[in-house]
Interface confidence: low
Amino acid sequence: MMTGTIETTGNISAEKGGSIILQCHLSSTTAQVTQVNWEQQDQLLAICNADLGWHISPSFKDRVAPGPGLGLTLQSLTVNDTGEYFCIYHTYPDGTYTGRIFLEVLESSVAEHGARFQIP
């Protein structure tokens, strides 16, 4: 029985050319996290495997940094980065948990700073 829940940063906005943190957290389960996948729509951005460590997809390696935690930092944002991002937690014995984040990249003069994710 899957009892866990995924908390995410939800819907966020950021300025073109800036950086943003995508963060998910799995709670309410004692299941062991074996791997976390980060995907943008149908593209794999990065994997963090409990045994093998991080792998960043080659097409994103210049703009994606691991962390904080099991999250991702996206840099040099463009309007094309707007869209859905998914954190996929592979766990044992529960199975797979998925969280969704929607990122909107705005022109600098329009971005709402208050909507940007702040690390507590």
Epitope: V33, C48, A50, W54, P68, L70
Partner: nanobody, 113 residues
């Protein structure tokens, strides 16, 4: 729970250098990531640099060529060598690992003449 202890901050003149250390203890996720963030007064916390177990490194554009991140995996310790410091580098510096929540108490770096 992971415990993170940062050290090495202080007051330095523009153009000077500092080396920050971050020691991690407790249950760490074995991906081997450690990173540094900073928060200047009145600003959001921002990412500075990251290092993986395999030695891969990433830097924010604002510190590229001036800061060097490294890690000693046997000691679960990350370092941030900061050279050619500028007044705008003044901030509380925090380290993180790939365990959650994973934030230390921070160490203050002040760059001023």
């Amino acid at each position: 729970e992971v415990q993170l202890v940062e050290s090495g901050g202080g007051l330095v003149q523009p153009g000077g250098s500092l080396r920050l250390s971050c020691a991690a203890s407790g249950n760490t996720f074995s991906g081997g990531f450690m990173g540094w963030f900073r928060q200047a007064p009145g600003k959001e916390r921002e990412w500075v640099a990251s290092v993986l177990r395999g030695g891969y490194t990433w830097y924010a554009d604002s510190v590229k060529g001036r800061f060097t991140i490294s890690a000693d995996n046997s000691k679960n310790t990350a370092y941030l060598q900061m050279n050619s410091l500028k007044p705008e580098d003044t901030a509380v510096y925090y380290c993180t690992t790939d365990s959650l929540p994973g934030w230390g108490q921070g160490t203050l770096v002040t760059v001023s003449s």
